[in-house]
């Protein structure tokens, strides 16, 4: 395919994968997809940090990269005639498996608009540097490659795939070696959690001398939410070293019997579970795990907890602490969103009033409505808005323009509308003649 | 389709053993959690044992635990219940179900009628 | 083990009528990640059991819209909104939220 498996690292729900090779955009995203995964999101600072995890792994493993300023995709784009849009964290780009817009980014440098062919993003790693927690890869935009031309300086790319929950690591209790074979065909010995229906093959004893046992499992969801392996005390149990190897793969206390036997016991305040091996807080929430506002509610058996926010509150990334829920991005309202904490409200705009179908309407203010008139005269009532009118005679006046004002005719732009003399009067005007003279039947002339 | 066929009818001495076959075809065997379910005559449905063919993993229900052997062959898709130390009171229909990926006993077997009779 | 009492022990319905079933538990089955594992099955007579109702109130594949379920944490409902001839049997509740899984002792409803 081009490209290798090189490290993987697993948080939470979900796996990233670093690969090297010199790949495009849409051979690397479809790597990922063949094994059920898409090019990587790095929604949040702390995903940007597993990101990084998994390329420092794979840098760690690779010789010798070509290029200083190494680049690797990930599953940010933007498709061909989608145009930058400067106000947005990830200015019109998309992630490729879908999902909203995130508040997260970190570009390399100011981006230039251009619309005219699909630009695909990579996370810039400058390999003369060590990658720190505070300097984080950040976001370089450009070409998206093609078959045989990845483009300049791409050494390789994420991958992210995501689990329904995550198994524990097998513990041994003396020598042995355990190997994950996960759903997205990597194979590791170290994984610091194992993803649902991954298989781990147990093989014990000191590797010089032949196996005495093995043992498979199976990463499985054992009753909702719980993800276990099924098996039950610690594997590879040694006489010879009793507690002493790996604290007899007990998650806390290991107690020897005379004959090289031992079992795990679990501290005060714990429980030893059904794979004979870990220990849970008899009551997980009695340590109040949660923070802000949030409530601790019990998972089944006791044996783990999940943290629940009220509502218009949601569970930050570190699952724990409730943070507000910005109903605004979701376009609740008509017009105008203010979000407010644990909730949100709808405004509307200046000639709008709340009201009509569906909950955060505006309808038009009606400024013309009997008693309500800002208008001296005439008024017409428009969508968002009202203009005055003036009857004959008299024009639009005053700062707002509602006030009618009498045309002195007399003076008007088109010269002297009277031969002779020109009376003003409220809205209209009349002519008159000198003593001697006799105003015409066409009320202007005088004769 | 999903199918459930179970072994015939079996007529037992108290103290002896019995063992039921559940063959399964239609879906992948290895990646769901088969069910063992009881009805005694007259009664309501009681849930004693679960296998994940998967790996073999078992849950027993604690009131038959070290009574009851649940075991799995991946090569033919075929779960095994057996049953030991037979009393009057384990006359029932077995049934073996599927777990869904809900948690629900989607697909059922026809069921085995075990008397046990002096 | 979660303990459940299932009401009324026998509900006879004329065709056309409505009917309910009731199941309560001795403790909740709403699940921290907000799935309720409450099920209801259907045993028709000389048949094995079938899946109606999964999570509270999803209708099973191929189960018809007369059927519905509702409930809070404990207390559970199972309405028919115009019952047939061909719903009789022995309906169960049964909880898959805790080992070992558990059954509600049945309740059998009968055309009068």
């Known amino acids: 395919t081009g490209a290798d498996t090189e490290a993987v690292v697993c948080v939470g729900t979900a796996c990233y994968t670093a690969h090297s090779g010199k790949l495009s955009a849409a051979e690397a995203q479809n790597h990922c997809n063949q094994n059920g995964g898409n090019l990587a999101t790095v929604k949040s600072k702390e995903e940007a940090q597993h990101v990084q995890r998994v390329l420092a792994q794979l840098l760690r493993r690779e010789a010798a990269l070509t290029a200083r300023m190494s680049k690797f995709w990930i599953g940010l784009q933007r498709e061909k005639g989608k145009c930058l849009d400067p106000s947005l964290p990830l200015k019109g780009f998309s992630w490729v498996g879908g999902g909203e817009d995130t508040p997260y980014s970190n570009w390399h440098k100011e981006l230039r608009n251009s619309c005219i062919s699909k630009r695909c993003v990579s996370l810039l790693l400058d390999l003369s540097q060590p990658l720190l927690p505070s300097r984080l890869p950040k976001w370089s935009e450009g070409p998206c490659g093609s078959p045989g031309s990845p483009g300049s300086n791409i050494e390789g790319f994420v991958c992210k795939f995501s689990f329904k929950g995550m198994c524990r690591p097998l513990a041994l209790g003396g020598p042995g070696q355990v190997t994950y074979t996960t759903p997205f065909q990597t194979t590791s010995s170290s994984l610091e959690a194992v993803p649902f229906a991954s298989a781990a093959n147990v093989a014990c004893g000191e590797g010089d001398k032949d196996e005495t046992q093995s043992h498979y499992f199976l990463c499985k969801e054992k009753a909702p939410d719980v993800f276990d392996w099924g098996s039950s005390g610690p594997l590879c149990v040694s006489p010879k070293y009793g507690c002493n190897f790996n604290n007899g793969g007990c998650h806390q206390d290991c107690f020897e019997g005379g004959d090289g036997s031992f079992l795990c016991g679990c501290r005060p305040g714990f429980r030893l579970l059904d794979d004979l091996v870990t220990c849970a807080s008899r009551n997980p929430c009695s340590s109040s795990p949660c923070r802000g506002g949030a409530t601790c509610v019990l998972g089944p058996h006791g044996k783990n907890y999940t943290c629940r926010c009220p509502q218009g509150y949601q569970l930050d990334s570190s699952q724990l602490d409730c943070v507000d829920v910005d109903e605004c991005q979701d376009s609740p309202c008509a017009q105008e969103c203010v979000n407010t904490p644990g909730g949100f409200r709808c405004e509307c705009w200046v000639g709008y009033e709340p009201g009509g179908p569906g909950e955060g309407a505006c309808q038009d203010v009606d400024e013309c409505a009997l008693g309500r008139s800002p208008c001296a005269q005439g008024c017409t009532n428009t969508d968002g808005s009202f203009h005055c009118s003036c009857e004959e005679g008299y024009v639009l006046a005053g700062e707002d323009g509602t006030q009618c004002q009498d045309v002195d005719e007399c003076v008007g732009p088109g010269g002297p509308l009277c031969d002779s003399l020109c009376f003003n009067t409220q809205g209209s005007f009349h002519c008159g003649c000198l003593p001697g003279w006799v105003l015409a039947p066409n009320g202007v002339s005088c004769t | 389709q999903v199918q459930l066929v179970q072994s015939g009818a079996e007529v037992k001495k108290p103290g002896s053993s019995v063992k039921v076959s559940c063959k399964a075809s239609?879906?992948?065997?290895?990646?769901?959690?088969l069910n063992w379910v009881r009805q005694a005559p007259g009664q309501g449905l009681e849930w004693f044992g679960r296998?994940?063919?998967?790996?073999?993993?078992?849950d027993y229900n604690g009131k038959f635990k070290g009574r009851v052997t649940l075991t799995a062959d991946k090569s033919t898709s075929t779960a095994y219940m057996e049953l030991s130390s037979l009393r009057s009171e384990d006359t029932a229909v077995y049934f073996c179900?599927?777990?869904?990926?809900?948690?629900?006993?989607?697909?059922w077997g026809q069921g085995t009628t075990v008397t046990v009779s002096s | 083990d979660i303990v459940m009492t299932q009401t009324p022990l026998s509900l006879p319905v004329t065709p056309g009528e409505p009917a309910s079933i009731s199941c309560r538990f001795s403790q909740s089955l709403l699940h921290s990640n907000g799935i309720t594992y409450l099920y209801w099955y259907l045993q028709k007579p000389g048949q094995s059991p079938q899946l109606l109702i999964y999570?509270?109130?999803n209708l099973a594949s191929g189960v018809p819209d007369r059927f519905s379920g509702s409930g809070s944490g404990t207390d559970f409902t199972l309405k028919i909104s115009r019952v047939e001839a061909e719903d009789v049997g022995v309906y169960y509740c049964a909880q898959n939220l805790e080992l070992p899984w558990t059954f509600g002792g049945g309740t059998k409803l009968e055309i009068k």
């Open positions: 239609g879906y992948a065997f290895s990646s769901y959690w």
């Open positions: 179900v599927r777990g869904d990926g809900y948690w629900a006993m989607d697909y």
């Open positions: 296998i994940y063919p998967g790996d073999g993993d078992t």
């Open positions: 999570t509270m109130s």
